[in-house]
């Protein structure tokens, strides 16, 4: 009998054991068996929910997500002269999401190849590490934007630079905290050789030892700690926030203000259904499954949520849209392949029409550069 | 219900040779990794050999003991389970049980009544 | 291979009473260890799985303990039907291996 180290390992669901016995595949050939998994992890790793519904997704994340946020921070970094500490946040946010999207790729060809991953252990642990840490600093950024957005209602104070270092220094310190609860996904080995399938997987089989209590109490923790404290956060702001507006005077401006409110409030809670609840809530039943019963019968819900969970980066432009008069200006601009100075340019002549003809039937919409807060 | 009825046991000399079939019916048998297992008589029981399904390429995995002497195979057509045994010792006489690997590969969840193969001069 | 060790051969007991049938397994095996049942005359039926999981239409006086290498089936009021072998079964790695089984006796 081939001995090998004796460690069974599960992954996301999957179950795998070292395997100590000889295996002939089906041409006679006898091969050293290291990792074998079960025929429900077979019939996941080389079904069409893995190998055709996730890439599918992944790629349309990508190719939403890396244009939108490319552009949003580039509006927040050099397109926006006042740094609010909104501006601030959603800049943080757009970073994470694309942080998160450049490594889609490489996510992408393992899923299409079969789950096989050939592009080393290193690379494997920074997708992952990145993937987990996109939706954590995505649900933290979202917080911090949504009470700014809050007290912004109720203090409505002029920009002050203190503010902004504040903004700068929670963002600093999300980044800092994310980092240091995502070490544990750096840290474990995330690949593993099935010889069985001749396959490399990245994520989806992991040691049973360090599966069956350790990934419960770390996502629980995660799932207490940095998804309902912030979401209890940002669900106390808007209602605050919809009670303010709803009890405020109602002129043009303030009804146009509230409407945009409305708009980021519903954005901000498809994210949290769609991306963040599902995810983090089977992240935590589908661990307590593996750690009470040994498997998971929540495994394909997981997995879509999981992938549902990358829609965020592709969600969060819209809240920029609602947010930032800048990034609204400039994202209107770009889906109407117009530059900006050129619909300055057309601004100033049909203003300088307007005022010699003492016309106001027509009136273009402000691209100065201009951020609400 | 699952259900697992094995044939094919009898009297062997040793050197010669038996092949014992297994009819399973009552689950999708294509999906299931399925066993043999052996208890010889007042022994306990000994894991034989193992055939993967099809999307592991019906991988098969033997003991020691029966290494390069016993084949395991499937028709999935047919839900049947086979046992090609050659070159048979003493040693091997023992109640032959045919077993399905739960599908999370998690222990054997069910047995069938079993066969006996008895090798005797 | 995992050797799964049950040190006692034989156990005897009364209609009603509880009974403990002990397995230690020669390196750890988390929780992957099942208990089947083995009724004289008969096939082996899974019982437990997973250390503490009973199977489908298993009687609730039935319950498993255990992980790492300690492991213990529990038989509450027991029945005279009880009368059987009871092997364990480590499933951490492969071969999957058993203990050498606990013949229960009813007084």
């Known amino acids: 009998t081939i001995q090998g180290t004796n460690r069974s390992s599960k992954g996301r669901s999957l179950i795998g054991k070292v395997d100590g016995t000889s295996h002939v595949t089906g041409k006679g050939v006898t091969v050293e068996t290291v990792f074998s998994v079960d025929e429900f992890s077979a019939s996941v790793l080389t079904g069409k929910l893995t190998t055709v519904f996730l890439p599918i997704v992944y790629t349309i994340v990508f190719v939403v997500g890396l244009p939108s946020n490319g552009m949003a921070l580039w509006v927040f970094l050099f397109r926006t002269k006042k740094k609010h500490p909104a501006v601030i946040y959603m800049a943080n946010l757009a970073l994470a999401d694309l942080l998160s999207v450049i490594w889609f790729p490489l996510k992408i060809a393992y899923h299409i190849h079969g789950n096989n991953w050939i592009y080393g252990e290193a690379l494997c642990n920074v997708l992952i590490g990145f993937f987990y840490g996109n939706m954590y600093c995505s649900i933290l950024f979202m917080t911090c934007l949504s009470v700014q957005r809050y007290w912004v209602i109720v203090n409505p104070m002029g920009h002050s630079r203190k503010k902004a270092n504040i903004a700068i220094g929670i963002s600093l310190a999300i980044w800092l905290l994310i980092l240091l609860v995502t070490i544990p996904l750096y840290v474990v080995k995330q690949t593993i050789f099935i010889p069985a399938l001749n396959i490399t997987t990245c994520h989806d089989v992991l040691p049973e030892q360090l599966l069956v209590g350790d990934m419960f109490n770390y996502f629980l923790s995660l799932a207490i700690g940095v998804f309902l404290f912030p979401a209890f956060l940002t669900a106390s702001a808007y209602v605050l926030m919809i009670r303010m507006l709803r009890s405020s005077a109602m002129d043009e401006n303030s009804e146009k203000k509230r409407k945009r409110a409305i708009k980021l409030i519903v954005t901000v809670l498809a994210m949290y259904l769609i991306c963040f609840t599902p995810s983090n809530l089977l992240l935590v039943v589908h661990y307590f499954l593996i750690k009470s019963q040994g498997q998971s019968h929540v495994y394909a819900l997981y997995i879509v949520a999981l992938c549902l969970s990358t829609l965020n980066s592709c969600i969060d432009p819209f809240v920029y849209y609602f947010v930032s008069h800048d990034f609204r200006d400039h994202a209107k601009n770009a889906l109407l392949c117009r530059s900006v100075r050129t619909v300055k340019q057309m601004q100033v002549s049909l203003t300088s029409k307007k005022h010699s003809r003492k016309s106001s039937s027509y009136s273009s919409s402000s691209t100065t550069v201009k951020t609400s807060y | 219900e699952v259900q697992l009825v094995e044939s094919g046991g009898g009297l062997v000399q040793p050197k010669g040779s038996l092949k014992l079939s297994c009819a399973a019916s009552g689950f999708t048998f294509y999906s299931y990794a399925m066993h043999w297992v052996r208890q010889a008589p007042g022994r306990g029981l000994e894991w034989v050999a193992r055939i993967r399904s099809k999307n592991v390429h019906y991988a098969t995995y033997y003991a020691d003991s029966v290494k390069d002497r016993f084949t395991i195979s499937r028709d999935d057509s047919q839900n049947m389970l086979y046992l090609q045994m050659n070159n048979l010792k003493t040693e091997d006489t023992a109640m032959y049980y045919c077993?399905?690997?739960?599908?999370?590969?998690?222990?054997?969840?069910?047995w069938g009544q079993g066969t006996t193969l008895t090798v005797s001069s | 291979d995992i050797v799964m060790t049950q040190s006692h051969k034989f156990m005897s007991t009364s209609v009603g009473d509880r009974v403990s049938i002990t397995c230690k397994a020669s390196?750890?095996?988390?929780?992957?260890v099942a208990w089947h049942q083995q009724k004289p005359g008969q096939s082996p039926k899974l019982l437990i799985y997973?250390?503490?999981n009973r199977h489908t239409g298993v009687p609730d006086r039935f319950t498993g303990s255990g992980s790492g290498t300690d492991f213990t089936l529990t038989i509450s009021n027991v029945q005279s039907e009880d009368l059987a072998d009871y092997f364990c079964q480590q499933y951490s790695s492969y071969p999957f291996t058993f203990g050498s089984g606990t013949k229960l006796e009813i007084k």
């Open positions: 997973w250390a503490s």
């Open positions: 077993v399905r690997e739960d599908y999370y590969g998690s222990s054997y969840d069910y």
């Open positions: 390196q750890d095996v988390r929780s992957a």
